[in-house]
Interface confidence: low
Amino acid sequence: SPVPPSTALKELIEELVNITQNQKAPLCNGSMVWSINLTAGVYCAALESLINVSGCSAIEKTQRMLNGFCPHKVSAGQFSSLRVRDTKIEVAQFVKDLLVHLKKLFREGQFN
C-alpha cells in the first residue's frame, strides 16, 4: 500500500540527513549541479538537477525517493523553468539546501 505522504517526506529527510552527516570527503567528488527554485515544484526540480549526477552511490537512494514524489518521468538533460539560470552549486550544498527546505515543509505540515 502507498506510504502516507508525511512518512515518505520524513524518510526523504532522514536520507538527506544521513548524507550530510556522513560526509568525510566532498560529496560526489565535488560534482556541480544546477541550483533550483525551492518555492514550487521542489521534488521534480530537485530530481531534474540531481539526475544528471552519475556514478555517485551516495545519492542514488535520494534520486529514487525523489522519483516517487515527482508525478512525471524525469530524464537526464531535462530542465524545467524552476532552474536558477546559470547557477551551479556543489552537490553537497544542493543536498543541504534541499534538506533545510524540506524540514521547513515538514514542520509546516506540507507533505505533498
Epitope: 520524513k10 532522514e14 550530510t20 552527516q21 560526509q23 553537497a92 550544498q93 543541504k96 524540514k103 514542520r107
Partner: antibody, heavy 122, light 108 residues
C-alpha cells in the same frame, strides 16, 4: 506555557550518587528528544546525554559513559539523569533541553530549563 | 571526535557588526545552531539550521555556513547583545552533540 524545570541538585561527596529530574509542561513531551547539558563554573557548555523521544536510544559523552544513565517517563512528562561515581570534575550547572527529533540527527535545543547546580566535594 | 573552534572573545562598538566564527572540518556539510547565554541565565537559541531564526529573535541575528567555517553575524549591535555565544552541531560519526568553546561578545 512551555517549561522545563530541573531539580535534584546539591552537594555530594566524590564517589557518591545523585539523581536529577526535569519536569516538562506545556508541550507534547513524548515527541521530543531530550538532552542533558552541563556547564562547569566559568566554563563553556558541555553536552552530557540524549534520549530519543520514545526512549529507544541513548547516547552519552565519553566523560560520563558508564557512570551516568538518562531515562524518561513519557506518562509523567519527566526526564531523569542518574549520576553514579561522581567526581569533582562533574561539578556544574546541569540543564535539561529539548530538541525536535529526526532520525540520526539532533535538532537545535529550542527550550532549556533554568538549570540545577551539582557540587561534588569532600 | 569532532571539534568546533571559536575565538574566545570578540569586541565591537554599539551600532557596528559583530561576526563570530565557528570552525570545524567540513562544517559546511553539517547543520549549525547558535546559542546566546547571558550571565546567570540558561542559553537561548538565536539561529538554527545554519541561518534560520526563531520567531522571537531580532532580524539583526543571522547565520551562514560553508566550507570549514560557520559564522554568526549580529548587525547593529546593542549593549544587550553582550553575552557568550556558542555554536553546536550533531556529530553523526560519534552520535554526540558537540559545542564550540564559546565566544564572549563585548560591546565597547
Amino acid at each position: 506555557q512551555m517549561q522545563l524545570v530541573e531539580s535534584g541538585g546539591g552537594v555530594v561527596q566524590p564517589g557518591r550518587s545523585l539523581r536529577l529530574s526535569c519536569a516538562a509542561s506545556g508541550f507534547a513531551f513524548r515527541t521530543y528528544g531530550m538532552h542533558w547539558v552541563r556547564q562547569a563554573p566559568g566554563k563553556g557548555l558541555e553536552w552530557v546525554a540524549v534520549i530519543w523521544y520514545d526512549g529507544s536510544n541513548t547516547h552519552y559523552a565519553d566523560s560520563v559513559k558508564g557512570r551516568f544513565t538518562i531515562t524518561r517517563d513519557n506518562s509523567k512528562n519527566t526526564l531523569n539523569l542518574q549520576m553514579n561515581s561522581l567526581r569533582a570534575e562533574d561539578t556544574a550547572v546541569y540543564y535539561c533541553a529539548r530538541a525536535p527529533q529526526w532520525y540520526l540527527s539532533a535538532e537545535a535545543f529550542d527550550l532549556w530549563g533554568q538549570g540545577t547546580m551539582v557540587t561534588v566535594s569532600s | 571526535s569532532y571539534v568546533l573552534t571559536q575565538p574566545p572573545s570578540v569586541s565591537v562598538a554599539p551600532g557596528q557588526t559583530a561576526r563570530i566564527t565557528c570552525g570545524g572540518n567540513l562544517i559546511g556539510s553539517k547543520l549549525v545552531h547558535w546559542y546566546q547565554q547571558k550571565p546567570g541565565q540558561a542559553p537561548v537559541l538565536v539561529v538554527y539550521d545554519d541561518s534560520d531564526r526563531p520567531s522571537r529573535i531580532p532580524e539583526r541575528f543571522s547565520g551562514s555556513n560553508s566550507g570549514n567555517t560557520a559564522t554568526l553575524t549580529i548587525s547593529r549591535v546593542e549593549a544587550g547583545d553582550e553575552a557568550d555565544y556558542y555554536c553546536q552541531v550533531w556529530d553523526h560519526s560519534s552520535d554526540h552533540v558537540v559545542f564550540g568553546g564559546g565566544t564572549k561578545l563585548t560591546v565597547l
